[in-house]
């Protein structure tokens, strides 16, 4: 991410090497770990992302009852498999030859196995719930101002189509952000949800993605929202698979 | 114009270490990636990895990984290549060329293992 | 790893002829594939980028075509000085990978 030529960076995307070599000679930048050149106009996926991340120098209540299918990512950083596209791999595997399937914001959604382990689709991840504990605030945030601004956020920042932002829940100190988007709902060129939550999930941990930006810096009418606490829990278009000891466990 | 200057051939004895450079001009060293590229005779090319001058970023080939090392000097424009334990496998021809297009090549060093 | 696949191995081509090198990936690539020519003992030299872009001194019998998997070089009429081995090379993700040549005789 330094070449000099007509400020050849790239501004969504810092964990990239960026040089004057693409096509017509223009700035192109590459994902660290892959070397695939990505569109500095819009996010990077995660899977290109956690790639990069793992090639770096070793770095009647309101709110929603997450579903008995949702996920949480318990299995932390993967040196992932990304297709052409960057997508993640329906199948990915580790250097012992343990595989299992994923969903497509790469969180594990089987039971782990062999390599005989078949993964025929990439089961898309449509509803994300991100769930926010602020820190203790004089008073309880204003819940339209706090809607309006997450919407603002995602739409400004992270480029995410406002139709995508389902809802915001607050009960303090409790927030909740669901976004929902169906396999046939998003078109060519918009934002996928799970790389609009990848990118909040790093800038709330003060990780930003973005190129010399500065961090988060997350105000609601002037009052600053500090995150203390988050859980993200993926919701897939085709209920995960895991046995029976696992639910148990 | 741009010119990538490697140096001379080398004649080494198994098991031992050799350093093999490959000098820039005529562009800006740190905004490209300097690619190296083995060929054996009457094979093919095959990919080493790459450097990033502008931050020391390095990609290998998993082959090559434990038996290539590569650095640069950003002061002198210089790309370097360390090959280590060497077999009569590693004799060839090693290329610099400046990537991702590999646009422009040195002229390779000859590289010679034998006891 | 993208495997790239030349064919045929030996192209033999009479002076003035048309000829076409292959080069198949192993999956979709974009237009993220470059030819280089090399001539005995001589270093490598780009003739074609991203699959069609020309190179400033390279003469123009030489031309590019293809996206995805499929790429192809043209000579639109074959000269004596062309007699050299011809590589394709794919810069889509690392590492990178080059074809294993095809070598161009003239009859």
């Known amino acids: 991410h330094t070449a000099a030529q007509d400020n050849c960076t790239c501004p969504t995307n810092k964990m990239t090497v960026c040089s004057p070599d693409g096509p017509g000679g223009r700035c192109q930048c590459r994902a660290l770990g892959s070397g695939m050149a990505v569109d500095c106009s819009t996010l990077t996926s995660k899977c290109l992302l956690l790639k990069a991340r793992m090639s770096a120098p070793k770095n009647a209540r309101t709110l929603v009852r997450p579903s008995e299918h949702a996920l949480v990512d318990n299995d932390g950083l993967y040196d992932p498999d990304c297709d052409p596209e960057g997508r993640f791999k329906a199948r990915q595997c580790n250097q012992t030859s343990v595989c299992w399937c994923v969903n497509s914001v790469g969180v594990r959604r089987t039971d782990k196995g062999d390599l005989s382990l078949r993964c025929d689709e990439l089961v898309r991840t449509h509803h994300i719930l991100i769930d926010l504990r602020h820190r203790p605030t004089a008073g309880a945030f204003n819940h339209s101002d706090l809607d309006a601004e997450l919407r603002r956020l995602f739409r400004e920042r992270y480029r995410l189509h406002p139709k995508f932002v389902a809802a915001v829940h607050y009960e303090q100190p409790t927030i909740q952000i669901e976004l929902r988007q169906n396999t046939s709902q998003k078109a060519a060129g918009d934002v996928d949800i799970g790389d609009a939550a990848y990118y909040f999930e790093r800038d709330i941990k003060g990780e930003s993605l973005f190129q010399g930006r500065g961090g988060l810096d997350l105000r609601v009418r002037g009052e600053p929202l500090q995150v203390e606490r988050t859980l993200i829990y993926y919701l897939d278009e085709i209920p995960p698979k895991f046995s029976m000891k696992r639910l148990t466990a | 114009q741009v010119q990538l200057q490697q140096s001379g051939a080398e004649l080494v004895r198994p098991g031992t270490s050799v350093k093999m450079s490959c000098k820039a001009a005529?562009?800006?060293?740190?905004?490209?990636?300097i690619d190296w590229v083995k060929q054996r005779p009457g094979h093919g090319l095959e990919w080493i990895g790459n450097i990033f001058p502008g931050g020391f970023y390095t990609n290998y080939n998993e082959k090559f990984k434990g038996k290539a090392t590569l650095t640069a000097d950003t002061s002198s424009s210089t790309a370097y290549m360390q090959l280590s334990s060497l077999t009569s496998e590693d004799s060839a021809i090693y290329y610099c060329a400046r990537g991702g297009v590999f646009d422009y090549w040195g002229q390779g060093t000859t590289l010679t293992v034998s006891s | 790893d993208i495997l790239l696949t030349q064919s045929p191995a030996i192209l033999s081509v009479s002076p003035g002829e048309r000829v076409s090198f292959s080069c198949r990936a192993s999956q979709s690539i974009g237009t993220s594939i470059h030819w280089y020519q090399q001539r005995t003992n001589g270093s490598p030299r780009l003739l074609i980028k991203y699959a069609s872009e020309s190179i400033s001194g390279i003469p123009s019998r030489f031309s590019g075509s293809g996206s995805g998997t499929d790429f192809t070089l043209s000579i639109n009429s074959v000269e004596s000085e062309d007699i050299a081995d011809y590589y394709c090379?794919?810069?889509?993700?690392?590492?990178?990978?080059f074809g294993g040549g095809t070598k161009l005789e003239i009859k």
């Open positions: 090379q794919q810069s889509n993700s690392w590492p990178y990978t």
């Open positions: 005529g562009y800006t060293f740190t905004n490209y990636w």
